[in-house]
């Protein structure tokens, strides 16, 4: 009589992931009585993936009925495939016994699994940072197979070279993760800029996967400060203006001091938009001239963001103010941007 | 699921002319497609794909001689000012379900003849 | 640009024989390589896919292995329709270009 042969037509079989996989098995003789049973892996530590007569495999089926009289098709589909599945496959035929003895087993199949990268999602500093300092960005992707996989940073279109990139694990595995930091370095210009990671995979149907960061989340942008003082007006009062430009992001408060006294505090509220991505904020305060024998020394301070207060000083000169209605004014900026 | 190439014909050097891909069975917005040529008695050779989405990818010796661009159904190949060269079988097919490392369905082709 | 080196260019073989043709890329291309048979006046059709996967519907005689750089086709018994040219292709993952080899052609001894 003719030996049993366990019969795998397939070496090996790629699927992607999320699809099903059809194990082929063919028996080339009904005889010796006995069941098939599929295992993943060889030896001891095989895996049982399906056995017909018992257990609950809810994502094997059969292809043909096998219980029908003269069944030689055991081939089974493992539906909803994903990386972990693979590995390789094997159709073992039994004899029927108390307990059932193997008796031969097929060359096995090696079930491969495609799977396509998660999409990639990328992350900025914890804390603000300002314009000439350098910020690191990390974009993570996973789960994806073959290892192979391309990840490119750019910063509005340009291709950044500062970036470190991590494959893991190293060596053999069902599935993958990338990792990577890219260093940004960023100036008064940024608020608009962004960050993209792109990531290329065999498996994308030839466009990479974007994340995507923006500075504006990233970048603080300080304000300059320029105090003025505009022409007398009629009434003996000085108007002095203390113009904050160029700042991001809005959160700032503005405290006029005369002579070393809180005199008024203000808080930016819906500015306009620069261009940019900056904003602007004028403040006015009115010097009553006639109320002071001596020069008035007014301090714009401005605290932006959380930051230490920056302090933009200025003197009235009262003795250079004539009482006379319409006269032209004699100040004198003392300031610098001073940080407390 | 079907690849048909027209437009092929016998043109003078110097002339420009437009390939089309025209498919059925499967949407355009999935897969990616490539053009490919083979010269009478050579080899095949790679001249650009398309995304699903839309963005093209060429050989590095097409050197903006040839446009793809597609469209629901079709995917077209503009050749411009074409040389003796060019003369070749014209093939579009389609990348593999599983990813774009190779084709699993070609059409027939279309001949071009480019000569004065 | 990678280029793929297929040899031999031409070969003469029986019915019954065992085939093999290799291919050679100039840089490691991993397992991203595809083996096609053409017959004179017809389109490509793919035979073997990401190196060692036979597509659907090919008959098991043919076969592929390698990795790297070093691929082969095996044909374990010629029959009359397996008279063709057969090209080896590679996708590069980092340039995500495709070069073909040259191709060989298979004749009747």
């Known amino acids: 009589e003719e030996e049993l042969q366990v019969i795998q037509p397939e070496k090996s079989v790629s699927v992607a992931a999320g699809d099903s996989a059809t194990l082929n098995c063919t028996v080339s003789s009904l005889i010796p009585v006995g069941p098939i049973q599929w295992f993943r892996g060889a030896g001891p530590g095989r895996e049982l993936i399906y056995n017909l007569k018992e257990g609950h495999f809810p994502r094997v089926t059969a292809v043909s009925d096998p219980t029908k009289r003269n069944n030689m098709d055991f081939s089974i589909r493992i539906s909803n495939i994903t990386p972990a599945d693979a590995g390789t496959y094997y159709c073992v035929k039994f004899r029927k016994g108390s307990p059932d003895v193997e008796l031969k087993s097929g060359a096995g199949t090696e079930l491969s699994v495609r799977a396509k990268p998660s999409a990639p999602v990328v992350s900025g500093p914890a804390v603000r940072a300002t314009a000439e300092h350098t910020v690191s960005f990390t974009c993570e992707s996973h789960g994806f197979s073959p290892r192979d996989i391309t990840l490119k940073w750019f910063k509005n279109g340009n291709e950044l070279s500062d970036v470190q990139t991590n494959v893991d694990p190293a060596g053999k595995s069902v599935s993958y993760s990338i990792r990577s930091t890219a260093r940004v370095l960023l100036t008064r210009r940024d608020v608009h800029s962004q960050v993209i990671c792109e990531v290329a995979h065999v498996t994308l149907q030839g466009d990479p996967l974007r994340g995507t960061a923006n500075l504006s989340e990233a970048i603080r942008v300080p304000p300059f400060l320029e105090v003025t003082q505009q022409s007398m007006r009629a009434d003996n009062q000085v108007n002095v203006t203390c113009q904050v430009t160029k700042f991001y992001p809005q959160r700032l408060q503005l405290t006029w001091l005369e002579n070393g006294n809180v005199s008024r505090t203000e808080m930016a509220s819906a500015l306009p938009e620069n261009k940019d991505g900056t904003y602007n904020w004028t403040s006015w305060l009115l010097v009553n001239v006639s109320a002071h024998r001596d020069d008035v020394k007014l301090t714009c301070q401005v605290e932006h963001d959380g930051q230490p207060a920056v302090n933009k000083s200025f003197s009235v000169k009262v003795s250079a103010h004539p009482k006379e209605q319409g006269s032209n004014t004699a100040a004198e900026n003392t300031g610098t941007n001073e940080r407390n | 699921v079907q690849l048909v190439e027209s437009g092929g014909r016998l043109v003078q050097p110097g002339t420009p002319l437009t390939l089309s891909c025209t498919v059925s069975g499967f949407s355009l917005s999935s897969y990616v497609m490539g053009w490919f040529r083979q010269a009478p008695g050579k080899g095949l050779e790679y001249i650009g794909i398309i995304s699903s989405s839309g963005s093209p990818y060429y050989a590095s010796w097409v050197n903006g001689r040839f446009t793809i661009s597609k469209t629901s159904t079709t995917m077209d190949l503009k050749m411009n000012s074409l040389r003796s060269e060019d003369t070749a079988t014209y093939f579009c097919?389609?990348?593999?379900?599983?990813?774009?490392?190779?084709?699993?369905?070609w059409g027939p082709g279309t001949l071009v003849t480019v000569s004065s | 640009d990678i280029q793929m080196t297929q040899s031999p260019s031409s070969l003469s073989a029986s019915v019954g024989d065992r085939v093999t043709i290799t291919c050679r890329a100039s840089?490691?291309?991993?397992?991203?390589l595809a083996w096609y048979q053409q017959k004179p006046g017809k389109a490509p059709k793919l035979l073997i896919y990401s190196a060692s996967f036979l597509y659907s519907g090919v008959p098991s005689r043919f076969s592929g292995s390698g990795s790297g750089t070093d691929f082969t086709l095996t044909i374990s018994s010629l029959q009359p329709e397996d008279f063709a040219t057969y090209y080896c292709?590679?996708?590069?993952?980092?340039?995500?270009?495709?070069?073909f080899g040259q191709g060989t052609k298979v004749e009747i001894k």
């Open positions: 840089q490691s291309i991993n397992s991203y």
């Open positions: 292709q590679s996708w590069h993952y980092i340039s995500r270009s495709y070069t």
């Open positions: 097919a389609r990348v593999g379900p599983l990813g774009v490392d190779y084709f699993n369905i």
